[in-house]
């Protein structure tokens, strides 16, 4: 066939509204004169004496030109049928990346503009290297590699086994039959880290203490607990119908609220963040509710908190003691403002 096959379904050719469009008769030899008709219409659009050979030229195509065309050879034989579809070349996709743990991240994208044409995305990434490798061949360990697209979630790819301290460049290229357009994004896991909210939040009264509530929770399931990468927590609580939250930063995985309003139900929620302040705070957990005990005041410490100090100590020791000090996070040496950015 003299017609180059654009990416997309067979038999379809593509053009841009407002531009000149050339349709190509697929079943003839290049340059052979043909006649062109709209499918189902007897009127000749372009005769074999046009001097355009096997091509039909539509000046300033618009939506009325979309549809199926038929080309015929000089002897009346069918040269082929062509469907014209109009749309736009890709614009640079908008890309963002996020991480819910310290060794994997995902990137999502959306089209910069709707092209109206069949579209696919090519996704890849590489580890950025420090300058100064004049004498060294680039290591295969820096990539590039494909960023595998999520079969269940369109417009998302996932990088597994990323290094927390490295910087990666993501390449998302939108491809359609009229061209391709690329967006690049540089990401550091430590900057895009946002844990999932803590799970299993429970709020319980403390028998004999009408102003106390005991809240406990667990790490999010997506955060593989490992001594080098701990989470810290922020807890908020408020009595029912009260507009303002009180905030505390607990140590470990529980907190005793000591200034609850007696007799009133309280909403409690908790959020998590890398313990060295990498990235941002998670979303808040779903609220849990609890009402302080209404029983008589007790002088004695209730059983559950007997040795509460040791329990907390044990949690902290278990999580903190094996952790070698991570280097403090350096501020990103990035633009101080966004004047005159280089267009991607």
């Amino acid at each position: 066939s003299p017609c180059p096959q654009a990416w997309g379904p067979p038999g379809v050719q593509y053009g841009q509204p407002g531009r000149s469009v050339k349709l190509c008769c697929p079943g003839v030899t290049a340059g052979d004169p043909v006649s062109w008709f709209r499918d189902g219409e007897p009127k000749l659009l372009q005769g074999p004496d046009s001097g355009l050979g096997h091509e039909l030229v539509l000046a300033q195509a618009d939506s009325t030109d979309e549809g199926t065309y038929i080309c015929q050879t000089l002897d009346g034989a069918l040269g082929g049928t062509v469907t014209l579809q109009l749309g736009f070349p890709p614009a640079r996709p908008e890309v963002s990346c996020q991480a819910v743990d310290y060794e994997n991240f995902s990137c999502t994208w959306s089209p910069g503009q709707v092209s109206g044409l069949p579209t696919r995305y090519l996704t890849s990434y590489r580890k950025k290297t420090l300058p100064g490798a004049e004498s060294q061949r680039e290591s295969p360990s820096t990539g590039p590699w494909p960023c595998p697209q999520d079969p269940l979630e369109a417009s998302r790819c996932v990088v597994h086994g990323a290094e927390f301290w490295s910087e990666y460049r993501i390449n998302v290229t939108e491809v359609n039959p009229l061209g391709a357009s690329t967006s690049l994004l540089d990401v550091r896991l430590q900057s895009i880290l946002r844990p999932d909210p803590p799970q299993g939040l429970r709020v319980e009264s403390v028998p004999g203490y009408p102003r106390r509530l005991h809240a406990s929770w667990t790490y999010p399931a997506s955060w593989r607990r490992q001594p080098h990468f701990l989470l810290k927590f922020r807890l908020q609580y408020r009595p029912a119908q009260h507009p303002a939250w009180s905030t505390v930063e607990p140590i470990g995985l529980e907190e005793v609220i000591t200034d609850a309003v007696a007799g009133l139900p309280h909403a409690v929620r908790v959020s998590a963040r890398d313990f060295l302040d990498a990235g941002t705070w998670s979303a808040w957990s779903p609220e849990a509710w609890g009402t302080p005990s209404t029983g008589p005041l007790q002088d004695e410490i209730p059983d559950w908190s007997q040795g509460h100090g040791q329990q907390l100590e044990a949690v902290v020791a278990q999580e903190d003691s094996p952790a070698p000090a991570r280097p403090s996070l350096q501020p990103d040496p990035r633009p101080l403002d966004h004047r005159d950015p280089l267009e991607q």
Partner: antibody, heavy 126, light 112 residues
Framework: EVQLLESGGGLVQPGGSLRLSCAAS????????MGWVRQAPGKGLEWVSY????????GYADSVKGRFTISRDNSKNTLYLQMHSLRAEDTAVYYC???????????????????WGQGTMVTVSS | QSALTQPPSASGSPGQSVAISCTGT?????????VSWYQQHPGKAPKLLIY???KRPSGVPDRFSGSKAGNTASLTVSGLQAEDEADYYC???????????FGTGTKVTVLG
């Protein structure tokens, strides 16, 4: 070895044209910003032109805008500089250079040229 | 696209320190942390010494250091050695071409 090798320089008359090439090896060329920097005899460095990794965006110094065109062929790991309407003041050593750049969600920024070629001399004279 | 301003020359004896300034505007040096420094020996291609204001590429001795205050960046060469005699250029992102601009260059002479 990470390397850039320029070629295509030479003697050309004022108003003439020349095409410089820069062959890259030892790194994934298609992922890097590339640029041309020139240095007139006995003078300082002057930024000439740059190109985005995919080739989709380019930029030029005012002194060459409209006369020079930068392009790249990622399948051949080669950077080009097509120069038209050459003037005596375009006489210089032309260096090809690599930049990793930095890309935020809104824009890309040139950072630093970490790899340089050895340069090719362009002389514009009658 | 005005070049960044550097002193034409600087000198020092072996073992001493020399500092080179690079003055731009809030649209280039002052507006971004993309300031780099290059060393160029006669007849050779430039070599990257400092990038992103303060960072040293692998293989560059720690005698070379960079800093920035406002619209002025500085390169300091401490413990001067004979091989440090060269031309030094600063560069910054943010010229009016949205790409980069070089400094006027400073010739460093190692005395004695």
């Amino acid at each position: 070895e990470v390397q850039l090798l320029e070629s295509g320089g030479g003697l050309v008359q004022p108003g003439g044209s020349l095409r410089l090439s820069c062959a890259a090896s030892g790194f994934t060329f298609s992922w890097y910003f590339m640029g041309w920097v020139r240095q007139a005899p006995g003078k300082g460095l002057e930024w000439v032109s740059y190109i985005y990794p995919s080739g989709g965006s380019t930029g030029y110094a005012d002194s060459v805008k409209g006369r020079f065109t930068i392009s790249r062929d990622n399948s051949k790991n080669t950077l080009y500089l097509q120069m038209h309407s050459l003037r005596a003041e375009d006489t210089a050593v032309y260096y090809c250079a690599r930049d990793e750049g930095y890309c935020s969600s809104t824009s890309c920024y040139f950072d630093a040229f970490d790899i340089w070629g050895q340069g090719t001399m362009v002389t514009v004279s009658s | 696209q005005s070049a960044l301003t550097q002193p034409p020359s600087a000198s020092g004896s072996p073992g001493q320190s020399v500092a080179i300034s690079c003055t731009g505007t809030s649209s280039d040096v002052g507006g971004y942390n993309f300031v780099s420094w290059y060393q160029q020996h006669p007849g050779k291609a430039p070599k990257l010494l400092i990038y992103e204001v303060t960072k040293r590429p692998s293989g560059v001795p720690d005698r070379f250091s960079g800093s920035k205050a406002g619209n002025t960046a500085s390169l300091t060469v401490s413990g001067l050695q004979a091989e440090d005699e060269a031309d030094y250029y600063c560069s910054s992102y943010g010229g009016s071409n949205n790409a980069g601009v070089f400094g006027t260059g400073t010739k460093v002479t190692v005395l004695g």
